[in-house]
């Protein structure tokens, strides 16, 4: 299964309106929204409509789109109105190869890394923004601290944990704290005057299809925090995995296609075939996420121009015992990071 659908050009001929030059109004003010937001199919983002009014299921590749029914911004889709001249009222969601991203009204080019603020580093890959926190103490001090508080320190970007019961702190807890920190997914090792740190990979930015996952690491010559990114594909969007769940079972933890295929990315094809495993689905309220995985390097060959390689998430096994929060909110897992709102807003 391809990492990314091969970009296609689709044409759409809208039904003629009485007045072909009149643009219909798709937004109504004041906003009129249903009481509860819609439930979107797996992998389809739940987003605010183009009128900035209601939650809608984002239009997908090939779907009709309007100023209200907007295309999925997390999938690098844009509304192509070229088939609706001269009104430009109804378009078709299309994929731009190497599409850039827009965050807070600022456009970023494909592959560009940027800091929306001092707390986060983000990367744009094919319309998807993946961010990692630069403040490396997302957890309160453990073991000895009974009353931790997260406070802003004047002149410093990152908030610090302070402990109101500092006076009762037992001695020699630094070693314990370090162990607790190391067990939490951070990789620590001391070399020269640098404490090496590698954050865990962020969750994949999409629940199906091609997404991005990022992490920060200072394991480099300068001991400087740098962002690494890898492509991820938790499950294909075009396969109904529920159909593969065995009789009597509630989950299919891992879905693996029968045939090995090439990965494709922006029109380029992997130099060898792969038979990847994908995370499956459950019929109850559980979600399947990668449990045992590694990062592999995939070489791509392009029809014109040089090839390139990309780091790609390779799933070995998935864990299906987490309750699903909102499977359509691709940034839901970022909420566990402090100041998530600062990325989202």
């Amino acid at each position: 299964t391809a990492l990314s659908p091969t970009p296609t050009t689709m044409t759409f001929t809208p039904a003629p309106l009485e007045e072909t030059t009149t643009r219909p109004e798709f937004c109504k003010w004041p906003c009129e929204c249903p009481q509860s937001p819609p439930r979107c199919p797996l992998g389809v983002s739940l987003i605010t409509d183009g009128c900035e009014c209601c939650k809608i299921c984002a239009q997908q590749l090939g779907d009709n789109c309007t100023e209200a029914a907007i295309c999925d911004p997390h999938r690098g889709l844009y509304c192509d109105y070229s088939g609706d001249r001269p009104r430009y009222a109804i378009g078709v969601c299309a994929q731009v190869v190497g599409v850039g991203c827009v965050l807070d009204g600022v456009r970023y080019t494909n592959g560009e890394s940027f800091q929306p603020n001092c707390r986060y580093n983000c990367t744009c890959i094919d319309g998807t923004v993946g961010c990692t926190p630069l403040c490396l103490s997302p957890r309160p001090p453990r073991l000895w601290c009974r009353q931790p508080r997260h406070v802003r320190v004047p002149g410093q970007c990152c908030e610090q944990w302070v402990c109101d019961d500092d006076a009762r702190r037992p001695r020699q807890t630094a070693l314990l704290d370090t162990r607790a920190f190391a067990a939490s997914g951070a990789v620590e090792q001391r070399y020269e005057n640098c404490i090496a740190y590698t954050s865990p990979w962020s969750p994949c930015s999409t629940t199906c299809g091609l997404g991005i996952s990022t992490r920060i690491s200072n394991v480099n010559a300068r001991c400087w925090p740098e962002q690494e990114s890898r492509l991820c594909n938790l499950r294909p969007c075009d396969v109904d995995i529920q159909l593969h769940i065995k009789a009597g079972k509630k989950c299919l933890a891992v879905y693996q296609p029968e045939e090995a295929t090439n990965f494709t990315l922006a029109g380029c094809v992997s130099t060898r075939t792969y038979r990847p495993k994908y995370c499956g689905v459950c019929t109850d309220n559980r979600c399947c996420i990668p449990y045992k995985s590694k990062t592999i390097s995939v070489d791509f060959q392009c029809p014109e121009g040089p090839g390139f390689s990309r780091q790609v998430l390779w799933i070995n096994a998935c864990f299906c015992n987490l309750s699903c929060r909102n499977p359509n909110d691709i940034f839901a897992d970022l909420e566990s990071y402090p100041d998530f709102e600062e990325i989202a807003n």
Partner: antibody, heavy 121, light 110 residues
Framework: EVQLVQSGAEVKKPGASVKVSCKVS????????MHWVRQAPGKGLEWMGG????????IYAQKFQGRVTMTEDTSTDTAYMELSSLRSEDTAVYYC??????????????WGQGTLVTVSS | QSALTQPPSASGTPGQRVTIACSGS????????VNWYQQLPGTAPKLLIY???QRPSGVPDRFSGSKSGTSASLAITGLQAEDEADYYC???????????FGSGTKLTVL
């Protein structure tokens, strides 16, 4: 090639807990599903539990539910099996054995050398 | 009481063909694959047959497995002295939601 090396023999009193370790080399734990099997003296093999790739969670034999905990430390590629509230009938050789995710079928191969746990007052 | 039943013992002379049966039910062998393990005296078990009839590399072709309905069997042709060991079948049991081993068969080469 995967190799599993287990911790040494243990003697425990009834009611105590034992924690057996299993160190992986040749592969990393992220590529393996670890299972634990025990064998009482002169008796057959008894599966205790392990990560089931099909169900996507660690499953335990009903007999050991609530008494056994299986954990992993991926930074050291070491798996652990802790059995609590020990009784004399828990005296056995405890084996770790792996299922490799590369395989299309569930098969336990290879196995650790075994750890003898003796429960005696 | 094992979910899979095996005869406690089997025997044969060198060069002979021996089969070991493994009987289960629709909740295990009937709907899942069977593996066979060999345990030589004083050693850890070793995978002998997986997926009913597949041999891992390094296992001689004298060993073969088969499955029919809710039963499986292991056949050893051209029996050799070094085949003297305990043999266990293993499958997944849906009703128990776990993996199960047979009671084991002690093979003696006379």
């Amino acid at each position: 090639e995967v190799q599993l090396v287990q911790s040494g023999a243990e003697v425990k009193k009834p009611g105590a807990s034992v924690k057996v370790s299993c160190k992986v080399s040749g592969y990393t734990l992220t590529e393996l599903s670890m299972h634990w099997v025990r064998q009482a003296p002169g008796k057959g093999l008894e599966w205790m539990g392990g990560f089931d790739p099909e169900d996507g969670e660690t499953i335990y034999a009903q007999k050991f539910q609530g008494r056994v905990t299986m954990t992993e430390d991926t930074s050291t590629d070491t798996a652990y099996m802790e059995l609590s509230s020990l009784r004399s009938e828990d005296t056995a050789v405890y084996y770790c054995a792996t299922f490799m995710f590369d395989h299309d079928w569930f098969q336990l191969d290879p196995w650790g050398q075994g750890t003898l746990v003796t429960v005696s007052s | 009481q094992s979910a899979l039943t095996q005869p406690p013992s089997a025997s044969g002379t060198p060069g002979q063909r021996v089969t070991i049966a493994c009987s289960g039910s629709s909740s295990n062998i009937g709907t899942n694959t069977v593996n066979w393990y060999q345990q030589l005296p004083g050693t850890a078990p070793k995978l002998l047959i997986y997926n009913n009839n597949q041999r891992p590399s390094g296992v001689p072709d004298r060993f073969s497995g088969s499955k029919s309905g809710t039963s499986a069997s292991l056949a050893i042709t051209g029996l050799q002295a070094e085949d003297e060991a305990d043999y266990y079948c293993q499958s997944y049991d849906r009703s128990l939601s776990g993996y199960v081993f047979g009671s084991g068969t002690k093979l003696t080469v006379l």
